[in-house]
């Protein structure tokens, strides 16, 4: 950002004074200020000097310094007051043009900030402002009439109190122009259309404007259609309507239809697409994978997108098993219409229970027939573990059964002392069983695996622990040999599976 010297945001000087404003930047800098006489400009690389040897009230204004090469577009400003006892106002423009509801700035700049307390805005010849004129004053910029109305198109003067008397500026003419309406407003109904060959169809193009002078037409694939026009006037607007009625559609009627309206302000157009099909259609699809895996206790939303014409005559979600004959609750099924021919159907399955794994099918029907889309839902479970001591072929063996989904991995640990769970400090040996025997592996069920650890002699002051883990969690079981026989410990946090 450039820097201005002197280092003040505003300066007050007397008429006839010498004023030198210096702007320094990293690159070249430029001055911008009100058009006024007597300024000279001297540039020297990264600095620029604006100076006058004879300041007048007309030099009152804001001088801005910019650095054109600065990508951030930074600027610095200083406001100069040249306080002339005879000239309290410097008027920068004598005509101001705005549209209705815009703010109108009347640029009469105060030449002495001390006078601010006694300023007012009046109409010429001392007439008061019109009622409801909302305005504000800035000594740097002038008076602003907020949200100007057409009726406020008047000649104004800025007034300042000097030594007990009001001193007026030259007049400023304000022209408030009515907002010229843009191109006509349009509607084209329907936004999309599908018909089977031989059916009837209707397309309606309508345009409205505050002014009667506008044209509207309907075109099919860039060909203007000759359609009788209906005209109306209501809600202070002129309306023109074109209705295309087709008794028996054929493939040549398909394509793009555009509704176009124009006036002196310009042109508006809106389009729709008309599809003609040979027969009814019904398409089901999903953005989701049809094979879903979810952890038990979590929720899942199954979503199906339906594209159909004619509309659906029936639809429902069905549970196909294998666990129970329960059916999805209707209140958990939700349907939303994206547009006339596309719908989304959602089945919410909150807090999934083991008996809710299996196949879910969405069925829909229209004159084109039945369609179905089936999801397969498998539940994930953390492993459950149990250990028993047995003899196999005469050898003492620890047998660990672990069930869960996905298939659990098994690790054996031997550690010193009697404990519910081996910690690192106690571990004497670790065995990973890379290929536990799969005892059961049915669709939608847990996978049960078995791992054997042959132990020649059970050490009585030691613990044998079987640990199983999968992507959901882990489980373990500690086996503690006791002289009176083997003793097993499930972990304290033994998992309860509903």
């Amino acid at each position: 950002i450039p820097v201005i010297e002197p280092s003040v945001p505003e300066l007050v000087v007397k008429p006839g004074a010498t004023v030198t404003l210096r702007c320094v930047g990293n690159g070249s800098v430029e001055w911008d200020g009100p058009p006024s006489p007597h300024w000279t400009l001297y540039s020297d690389g990264s600095s620029s000097i604006l100076s006058t040897n004879n300041a007048t009230f007309q030099n009152t204004g804001t001088y801005r310094c910019t650095e054109p090469g600065d990508p951030l577009g930074g600027s610095a400003a200083i406001h100069l007051y040249v306080k002339d006892p005879a000239r309290p106002w410097n008027v920068l423009a004598q005509e101001v043009v705005v549209f209705e509801d815009q703010d109108a700035l009347l640029p009469c700049l105060l030449t002495d900030p001390v006078l601010e307390a006694g300023v007012s805005l009046v109409r010429v010849r001392g007439r008061p402002l019109m009622r409801h004129t909302n305005y504000s004053f800035s000594p740097w910029h002038g008076f602003t009439i907020h949200r100007a109305k057409f009726i406020q198109s008047q000649d104004y003067q800025c007034s300042a109190l000097m030594g007990g008397r009001k001193v007026m500026s030259i007049s400023i003419r304000l022209k408030v122009q009515k907002v010229i309406p843009g191109p006509p407003a349009l509607t084209l109904v329907p936004a999309e259309l599908v018909r089977i060959r031989g059916e009837a169809a209707q397309i309606v193009c309508s345009a409205s404007s505050v002014d009667v002078n506008f044209d509207v037409f309907l075109q099919h694939n860039n060909t203007k259609l000759a359609i009788p026009q209906q005209s109306d006037f209501h809600n202070n607007r002129y309306q023109k309507v074109l209705t295309l009625n087709l008794d028996q559609v054929d493939f040549q009627h398909a394509g793009n239809y555009s509704c176009v309206a124009s006036n002196v302000q310009g042109k508006h157009s809106t389009s729709m697409f008309f599809r003609v099909v040979e027969s009814a259609y019904l398409n089901l699809s999903s953005e989701q994978n049809l094979i879903q895996e979810v952890t038990v206790g979590e929720g899942l939303n199954l979503k199906v997108m339906v594209e159909a014409y004619p509309g659906l005559q029936g639809f429902n979600w069905t549970y196909l098993g294998p666990f129970s004959d329960h059916q999805p609750e209707p209140k958990l099924a939700n349907a939303t219409t994206k547009d006339t021919y596309r719908h989304t159907f959602t089945l919410s399955l909150p807090r999934l229970k083991p008996s809710e794994a299996g196949r879910y099918s969405f069925l829909a029907r229209n004159p084109g027939g039945w369609r179905a889309l089936t999801f397969e839902l498998t539940l994930r479970y953390p492993p459950e573990v149990s250990v028993i001591w047995t003899f196999i072929n005469g050898s003492g063996t620890l047998l660990c059964a672990a069930s869960g989904y996905p298939q659990p991995n098994v690790t054996w640990l031997q550690c010193s002392g009697h404990t519910d769970r081996c910690d690192e400090a106690q571990v004497l040996q670790v065995w990973d069983d890379p290929y536990p025997e799969v005892l059961s592996q049915e669709p939608f069920h847990k996978v049960t695996v078995q791992s054997l650890l042959t132990v020649e002699t059970l050490e009585h002051n030691q613990t044998y622990e079987c640990r199983a883990h999968n992507s959901v969690g882990s489980g373990s079981w500690a086996f503690i040999p006791i002289s009176a026989g083997a003793h097993t410990h499930p972990p304290d946090e033994f998992l309860f599976t509903p």
């Epitope: 820097v3 010297e5 002197p6 280092s7 003040v8 945001p9 505003e10 300066l11 000087v13 004074a17 010498t18 030198t20 210096r22 400003a77 900030p113 601010e116 307390a117 800035s138 000594p139 740097w140």
Partner: antibody, heavy 112, light 106 residues
Framework: QVQLQESGPGLVKPSETLSLTCTVS????????WSWIRQPPGKVLEWIGY???????NYNPSLKSRVTISVDTSKNQFSLKLSSVTAADTAVYYC??????WGQGTTVTVSS | DIQMTQSPSTLSASVGDRVTITCRAS??????LAWYLQKPGKAPKLLIY???SLESGVPSRFSGSGSGTAFTLTISSLQPDDFATYYC????????FGQGTKVEIK
């Protein structure tokens, strides 16, 4: 006749933030520019910074990292915040309108 | 930073004397210089701005001159109310003050 009045705690602990308020009466804070200046005991005047009604602010480079000057136009007040103070910040603090109207000053001592 | 050096630091004078205080800037400040008067326990009061412009309400016995780096404050005829400390201040680049000149009764 515009008058300025400084207010705030007379004692601030080291490392804390000094907060002062200047109340403007007899005129609007929505024009001119307003500054803070301080004078340590028996020492030279030191400019802290100013802000202008159009949103322009400028701070003494040696204090910039610790200073914030803000304005509340609804209360016709502006304030100074100086963070991480030390004994060297002990001074009489003045608020001013431009260079011509000054408050009478308020003494701030930094001590534990 | 621009340094401002005032001289003398102390000046003894009598009522009616013509008094001159000088202020020197470490680099050119054009004529962006102000002079203040300060009495013990009081806020400074603006006397001169833009090196030579007299602030409204200030007696005409005070005048300022100079540009660039050398500036002078002159009191044409010292009055009892003028015994105080005087400060110069540059506002060309940020603001800095001189160290002050104390005018005391001789």
């Amino acid at each position: 006749q515009v008058q300025l009045q400084e207010s705030g705690p007379g004692l601030v602990k080291p490392s804390e933030t000094l907060s002062l308020t200047c109340t403007v009466s007899g005129g609007s804070i929505s024009s001119y520019y307003w500054s803070w200046i301080r004078q340590p005991p028996g020492k030279v005047l030191e400019w802290i910074g100013y802000f202008s009604y159009n949103g322009n602010t400028n701070y003494n480079p040696s204090l910039k990292s610790r200073v914030t000057i803000s304005v509340d136009t609804s209360k016709n007040q502006f304030s100074l915040k100086l963070s991480s103070v030390t004994a060297a910040d002990t001074a009489v603090y003045y608020c001013t309108r431009g260079m011509d109207v000054w408050g009478q000053g308020t003494t701030v001592t930094v001590s534990s | 930073d621009i340094q401002m050096t005032q001289s003398p630091s102390t000046l003894s004078a009598s009522v009616g004397d013509r008094v001159t205080i000088t202020c020197r800037a470490s680099q050119s400040i054009s004529d962006w210089l102000a002079w203040y008067l300060q009495k013990p326990g009081k806020a400074p009061k603006l006397l001169i701005y833009k090196a030579s412009s007299l602030e409204s309400g200030v007696p005409s016995r005070f005048s300022g001159s100079g540009s660039g780096t050398a500036f002078t404050l002159t009191i044409s005829s010292l009055q009892p109310d003028d015994f105080a400390t005087y400060y110069c201040q540059q506002y060309n680049s940020h603001w800095t003050f001189g160290q002050g000149t104390k005018v005391e009764i001789k």
